[in-house]
């Protein structure tokens, strides 16, 4: 005669409040004759969860028909799960006896725990922008999950980051937990189009992790490089001077021209172009009138980028004798 085994396949069963939980239990033998009862907990304080023969268990139904002669499946379903239902559930075989049945063998137990999904991770970057080569911190938070075990990873453009610190609170027993992680990211000049991703994996997500993202464009400031050049060609009695402001981010930029220290109010032509890496180039043209009275013309292109201190580039205008003569010829 085969020895009876009580099989409870799941060690842990995660359930959600309000849902129905299925607790599995199968037996390997029909002998000895006697009922299978379900309990929660062990020892004298264990609670009777289901007894097919007697009692009223409105939230419990059986998966199989227990009245069938060769039934070996004693699994049950518990509906409308509440936090009060957590605990370890045991299916226990009793041997028919007189006047009362006697406990014969217990299953290993299935721990029922409340599973709550983590909230969508929220990633927050630094309050102020920082220039490349510097380190910035990003925080990721997710709340309301249970059980406590959770995995959090950081990525930058698909590459996993290692410089981060994670905390799960509270440390003791709780209905729900929160995770907070801070990652340190070194900014590269091309990071305007980069993204950091916080990825949270939890048993309730069935292998489909949640992600929160932040764009490094919100955290980075790429300062411009300036170049002021004089065009070799002139237009009538005017010389064209160009100020090229290259590779800056964000777009916020103020450009002013000064002639011998005097700010010029007049309109200048300009163009803004976007580079592949997300930075911008700004080109401004300034036309200077050439006359023989003007020997030393110093032009200054001053740029104020994203509220930072102004940077400027100067150019001493080179006016050849030939140009002066032409200018004089052109002046009435």
């Amino acid at each position: 005669e085969e020895e009876l085994q009580m099989i409870q396949p799941e060690k842990l069963l995660l359930v959600t409040v309000g849902k129905t939980a299925t607790l599995h239990c199968t037996v390997t033998s029909l002998l000895p004759v006697g009922p299978v009862l379900w309990f929660r907990g062990v020892g004298p304080g264990r609670e009777l969860i289901y007894n097919q023969k007697e009692g009223h268990f409105p939230r419990v139904t059986t998966v199989s028909d227990l009245t069938k002669r060769n039934n070996m499946d004693f699994s049950i379903r518990i509906s409308s799960i509440t936090p009060a239902d957590v605990g370890t559930y045991y299916c226990v075989k009793f041997r028919k006896g007189s006047p009362e049945n006697v406990e014969f063998k217990s299953g290993p137990g299935t721990e029922m725990a409340l599973g709550a999904k983590p909230s969508a991770p929220v990633v927050l970057g630094p309050a102020a922008r920082t220039t490349p080569e510097h380190t910035v911190s990003f925080t990721c938070e997710s709340h309301g999950f249970s059980p406590r075990d959770i995995t959090l990873k950081w990525f930058k453009n698909g590459n996993e980051l290692s410089d981060f610190q994670t905390n799960v609170d509270p440390t003791g027993q709780s209905v729900a937990y929160s995770i907070r992680s801070t990652a340190r990211v070194v900014l590269d000049p091309w990071d305007v189009r980069s993204q950091v991703i916080c990825e949270v994996a939890h048993v309730t997500l069935q292998g489909d992790p949640l992600r929160g993202t932040a764009n490094l464009s919100e955290a980075i400031r790429v300062p411009p490089t300036l170049e002021v050049t004089q065009q070799p060609m002139r237009v009538g009695n005017q010389v064209n001077v160009t100020c090229q402001v290259r590779k800056f981010y964000p777009q916020s930029l103020q450009l002013t021209w000064s002639e011998n220290g005097n700010v010029c109010q007049r309109e200048t032509a300009s163009t803004l172009t976007e580079n592949k890496d997300g930075t911008y180039n700004w080109t401004s043209w300034f036309l200077v009138n050439i006359s023989d009275q003007r020997d030393d013309v110093v032009l200054t292109c001053q740029v104020k980028h994203d509220g930072q201190l102004a940077v400027s580039k100067r150019l001493a205008l080179e006016v050849t004798v030939h140009q002066k003569d032409q200018s004089s010829d052109a002046t009435p």
Epitope: G43, P44, G45, R46, E47, L48, P99, E100, V102, E103
Partner: antibody, heavy 122, light 107 residues
């Protein structure tokens, strides 16, 4: 009628052990946990532990682990408790009582033995 | 462990008087509380189970109730045999714990 008959008064020397008994009658012995409770002179009640005759499963109050040992003989429906390394602190009346094989409100500590008085003295 | 704080530890009352004994649980025990009576010869008898259910054979003058974590045993008209010791017991969580007891004395 359910009854618990406990063994008689014991006078014991410090450092020795005593083993007392509690014989149950009037119901199925194997359907109940047998509990033991201590009451020191002029003191309150303290739960020591319990044993389940079906599989000799025991549960103890941490304070009495290593001090008390619970056993049963199902054929005679008798529960035993041995108290070892006796000191004056162990002088008390020891009661047996029972609860059902699961937590059934109506069955918790309904019936009590008359108690066994243990006096520890040199 | 769950602490059961019983009060008062002793109480003097007169025949026919109504008295209440209280036990306060340090943690949630639901309704899993018994009231026990102990005679001077040591005999222990259960009076109330599950906070308010009266055991068979126990006079109706005994009643049990609950308010939050406070559990009460009320004797509505004291009789001479009631002047003994009373204990509460929680059976919600192991180790099962008793209140310190109340000695009811005749005035």
């Amino acid at each position: 009628e359910v009854q618990f008959q406990q063994s008689g008064t014991v006078l014991a020397r410090p450092g020795t052990s005593v083993k007392m008994s509690c014989k149950a009658s009037g119901s199925t012995f194997t359907s109940y946990w047998m509990h033991w409770v201590k009451q020191g002179p002029g003191q309150g009640l303290q739960w020591i532990g319990a044993i389940y005759p079906v599989n000799n499963d025991t549960t103890y109050n941490q304070k009495f682990k290593g001090k008390a040992e619970l056993t049963v003989v199902t054929s005679t429906s008798t529960a035993y408790m041995e108290v070892s390394s006796l000191t004056n602190e162990d002088s008390a009346v020891y009661y047996c009582t029972r609860s059902f094989y699961y937590s059934l409100d109506a069955a918790w500590f309904v019936y009590w033995g008359q108690g066994t008085l243990v006096t520890v003295s040199a | 462990d769950i602490q059961m704080t019983q009060s008062p530890s002793s109480l003097s009352a007169s025949l026919g008087e109504r008295v209440s004994l209280t036990c306060r649980a340090s943690q949630d025990i639901g309704s899993r509380l018994n009231w026990l009576q102990q005679e001077p010869d040591g005999t222990i008898k259960r009076l109330i189970y599950a906070t308010s259910s009266l055991d068979s054979g126990v006079p109706k003058r005994f009643s049990g109730s609950r308010s939050g974590s406070d559990y009460s045993l009320t004797i509505s008209g004291l009789e001479s045999e009631d002047f003994v010791d009373y204990y509460c017991l929680q059976y919600a969580s192991s180790p099962f714990t008793f209140g310190g007891g109340t000695k009811l004395e005749i005035n």
